[in-house]
């Protein structure tokens, strides 16, 4: 149980293209065929103008035309929906496939990839039907770009919706040593963070988010996974104590703004018969800015490193109400391996703490849309898009 963390199954609310809570000013495009196929006509199920956004230039062979949606705040985007240009039966244009790029800061753009590294998403087969695509893994983004594709020179048009929820954790990135491979007699268990969207340098992953923040918790047997067609160890990121003579794995966490931290929850494996143990303890330090020193004595939380019940579980580490925008936590080994599947935080934004990232004046002027001001997880009166067998999701 990861009480306090978001439930990805419920993070599937329409984010405002169709119902227009995303204003026209937050939709932009690389180009438009005409004013009647401009950015503002890219809303799912909309029949305004000529019935969709259509780029001015061809999308084959170069895939450079895009439709950009600014969500104004960080969201977890779990699902996207696309349509072509129907226009009361007059439109024939649609995109059979597309790519997504996303950004949390407006500067660095990441390509969305599925769990096997594929970027291309199957799109529409006709101009009118809505095709929903479950994003596995989901993306934490403020800006999302759709890049329609074609396999020959042809016209493509697009209408879209995004589904997800507000990213309430406020976590911008975590830094951690690269996850390692466990050699068991019968199988290689790859305990790497396979969806990490930051940088990797030397032994370090930094500047991104990945499997430790995707809402998916691992099973009791770390060789198994809830995902289909993935390799053993997929749900976990793990480190061998033999790589860390210090006796701990060190991680850093960067948040969107100054926060008061109550609790950190770490979902850990405890299959001690194969060497995975809960941490023996956790130490965390805080700082308010990137160039500042870590403040005072770390918060220390001793754990049993329990050999007992081998089931995976979430451990809750009290953080004592300390204030910061950066955390550095050391997880102490109590056995041969540390295996984590999820790390989340319960925190409160410090009053009058404005977004510190990205800095002004990159963002367009104007107040944020009012529909997100309440910090609600789900928009009022909406039902999340169901994820069920037989549903029209890819």
């Amino acid at each position: 149980d990861m009480k306090g963390h978001f439930d990805p199954a419920k993070c599937r609310y329409a984010l405002g293209m169709q119902d227009r809570t995303i204003p026209d000013s937050d939709i932009s495009v690389s180009s438009s065929w005409s004013d009647s196929t401009a950015a503002r006509h890219s809303r799912l199920e909309s029949s305004d103008g000529d019935g969709a956004w259509c780029p001015a230039g061809p999308v084959f062979p170069k895939e450079e035309e895009y439709l950009q949606v600014d969500l104004r705040r960080l969201h977890l985007v779990a699902l996207v929906g696309t349509q072509g240009r129907h226009a009361g039966g007059l439109g024939k244009e649609f995109s059979r496939s597309y790519r997504l790029r996303y950004s949390r800061d407006g500067r660095r753009w990441m390509d969305w990839k599925d769990r096997w590294g594929q970027e291309v998403i199957s799109g529409n087969e006709d101009p009118g039907g809505v095709v929903l695509k479950d994003l596995g893994p989901p993306m934490v983004a403020r800006l999302v770009r759709f890049y329609p594709r074609a396999d020959r020179v042809m016209s493509v048009c697009l209408r879209v919706e995004l589904y997800g929820c507000l990213w309430r954790d406020g976590l911008l990135s975590y830094t951690a040593p690269v996850g390692q491979t466990m050699q068991l007699s019968e199988v290689m268990v790859h305990l790497n963070d396979s969806t990490y969207d930051g940088y990797t340098a030397g032994g370090l992953q930094y500047g991104g988010l990945g499997q430790l923040a995707d809402g998916v918790v691992g099973l009791d047997d770390f060789r198994q996974s809830q995902e289909l067609r993935v390799w053993p160890g997929y749900d976990y990121v793990g480190w061998s104590n033999q790589s860390f003579p210090t006796g701990y794995v060190e991680m850093e966490f960067e948040f969107d703004r100054l926060r008061t931290f109550q609790t950190m929850q770490v979902h850990c494996n405890n299959m001690h018969t194969l060497g995975a143990r809960l941490p023996g303890g956790v130490e965390c330090r805080f700082k308010r800015g990137p160039a500042m020193a870590w403040e005072g004595e770390p918060v220390r939380h001793a754990l049993g490193g329990s050999l007992g019940d081998p089931r995976a579980r979430a451990i809750s580490v009290p953080l004592g109400g300390h204030v910061g925008r950066f955390l550095q936590c050391r997880f102490l080994f109590a056995g041969p391996w540390l295996l984590f599947s999820e790390i989340s935080f319960i925190s409160d934004v410090v009053n009058d703490s404005s977004d510190t990232f990205p800095p002004a004046p990159w963002w367009p002027p104007g107040p944020p849309p009012t529909n997100f001001s309440s910090l609600e997880l789900e928009p009022r009166g909406q039902q999340p898009v169901a994820k069920a067998e037989g549903s029209p999701t890819a």
Epitope: P177, V178, G179, Q180, T181, Q183, H190, L191, N192, Y199, T200, A201, G202, G203, L204, Y206, W239, S240, Q242, S243, F244, P245, T246, E250, Q328, P336
Partner: antibody, heavy 121, light 107 residues
Framework: QVQLVESGGRVVQPGRSLRLSCTAS????????MLWVRQAPGKGLEWIGT???????YYASWAKGRFTISRDNSKNTLYLQMNSLRAEDTAVYYC???????????????WGQGTLVTVSS | DIQMTQSPSSVSASVGDRVTITCQAS??????LAWYQQKPGKAPKLLIS???DLASGVPSRFSGSGSGTDFTLTISSLQPEDFATYYC?????????FGGGTKVEIK
């Protein structure tokens, strides 16, 4: 171009101090574990010490107290401060960058060309 | 501190021979082992990390195996450019000792 260039090696008298530099280009030093390794003439490789991306330092037991590793991020330069030098410290000194393979384990993928330190009266 | 012991210290072999070099750690180091090749007057070159992962550009005739305390580097068919000295290294996030080296010479 990604490279490491050591400098500062020279002939020095026993008991004196010397600081070696290792300047990185094409990448940021502070995103890697960086190591100093030496090799006496006709001998094998000998690990001296390591500095982590979090500025934690580790030393071989024989190097503790006499050798200090540091870095200046603004100059993208790694340093090895050597004090109370002895004849047996005569060696080629290398800096090296630790990278990870597909299995998440470290190896020294990038090395400098080495700089020769000769301790002699 | 962990010690790494390599054997043999030298080996004479001919082109086409299979050569095996062993490295023993004074205590278990799991998979935290790398192998290097060094030629006279040159810096070492990484061959293998994580016991068996070949570094970029390393020919497939090189292979690594082992776990715990005993490790092996194998050259399946020795080539002229393989005559060199080989080192193992325990390389964790911290102290990183090398083995004493094995010189592969022309018979």
């Amino acid at each position: 171009q990604v490279q490491l260039v050591e400098s500062g090696g020279r002939v020095v008298q026993p008991g004196r101090s010397l600081r070696l530099s290792c300047t990185a280009s094409g990448f940021s030093l502070n995103r890697y574990y960086m190591l100093w390794v030496r090799q006496a003439p006709g001998k094998g490789l000998e690990w001296i010490g390591t500095i982590s991306y979090g500025d934690t330092t580790y030393y071989a037991s024989w190097a503790k107290g006499r050798f200090t590793i540091s870095r200046d991020n603004s100059k993208n330069t790694l340093y090895l401060q050597m004090n109370s030098l002895r004849a047996e410290d005569t060696a080629v000194y290398y800096c090296a960058r630790a990278d990870t393979g597909d299995n998440g384990y470290l190896g020294l993928q990038l090395w400098g060309q080495g700089t020769l330190v000769t301790v002699s009266s | 501190d962990i010690q790494m012991t390599q054997s043999p210290s030298s080996v004479s072999a001919s082109v086409g021979d299979r050569v095996t070099i062993t490295c023993q750690a004074s205590q278990s180091i799991g998979s935290v082992l790398a192998w290097y090749q060094q030629k006279p007057g040159k810096a070492p070159k990484l061959l293998i990390s994580g016991v068996f992962d070949l570094a970029s550009g390393v020919p497939s005739r090189f292979s690594g195996s082992g776990s715990g305390t005993d490790f092996t580097l194998t050259i399946s068919s020795l080539q002229p450019e393989d005559f060199a000295t080989y080192y193992c290294q325990y390389i964790p996030y911290g102290s990183s000792p090398f083995g004493g080296g094995t010189k592969v010479e022309i018979k």
